[in-house]
Interface confidence: low
Amino acid sequence: MMTGTIETTGNISAEKGGSIILQCHLSSTTAQVTQVNWEQQDQLLAICNADLGWHISPSFKDRVAPGPGLGLTLQSLTVNDTGEYFCIYHTYPDGTYTGRIFLEVLESSVAEHGARFQIP
């Protein structure tokens, strides 16, 4: 039975050329996280494997940094980065949990974080 829940940064916005942290947090489960995949719509951005560490997709290597934690930092944002991002937690024995973040990249300086990640 899957009892866990994923908290995310929710809907966020950022300025073109800036950076943003995509953050998910899995709670309410004792399942072991074996791998976290970060995907943008149908593209794989990065993988964080518990044993092997981080792998960043070659096409995103220049603009994606691993962390903080199991999160992902997107740099040098462009308007084309606007869209849905998914954190996919592979766990044992629960299975797969998925969190969704919507990022809007704005041209002007009106960008504000739509939601804050809760720090314990």
Epitope: H25, G53, W54, G67, P68, G69, I119
Partner: nanobody, 118 residues
Framework: EVQLVESGGGLVQPGGSLRLSCAAS????????MGWFRQAPGKERELVAA???????YYADSVKGRFTISADNSKNTAYLQMNSLKPEDTAVYYC????????????WGQGTLVTVSS
């Protein structure tokens, strides 16, 4: 056991500068992040800046161009250079370390108070 010790806080006038230091022990600053959070009275703790062992950095929009985070990997120490300080930068500043796997920002320092006032 991970230990983080901050120093460098204090009282500074608006427009002034401070440099915070965070000395870490109990882990190797490798495949990890170190960062600075701050918490003003009545507000949530917020991430101000973070840096990887590889030198990748993150800044909150409110401090971009004014604050600079850096690290000396050999000393396991992170620094936060704060310039052009504003009264709204007044807060307790916490150093945090995240050893890449597990809970996010699970290791915290005790905090150092920065007061920006004339």
């Amino acid at each position: 056991e991970v230990q983080l010790v901050e120093s460098g806080g204090g009282l500074v006038q608006p427009g002034g500068s401070l440099r915070l230091s965070c000395a870490a022990s109990g882990f190797t600053f490798d495949r990890s992040w170190m960062g600075w959070f701050r918490q003003a009275p009545g507000k949530e703790r917020e991430l101000v800046a973070a840096i990887t062992s590889g030198g990748s950095t993150y800044y909150a929009d409110s401090v971009k161009g004014r604050f600079t985070i850096s690290a000396d990997n050999s000393k396991n120490t992170a620094y936060l250079q704060m310039n052009s300080l504003k009264p709204e930068d007044t807060a307790v500043y916490y150093c945090a370390a995240d050893v890449w796997y597990g809970s996010t920002w699970r290791n915290w320092g005790q905090g150092t108070l920065v007061t920006v006032s004339s």
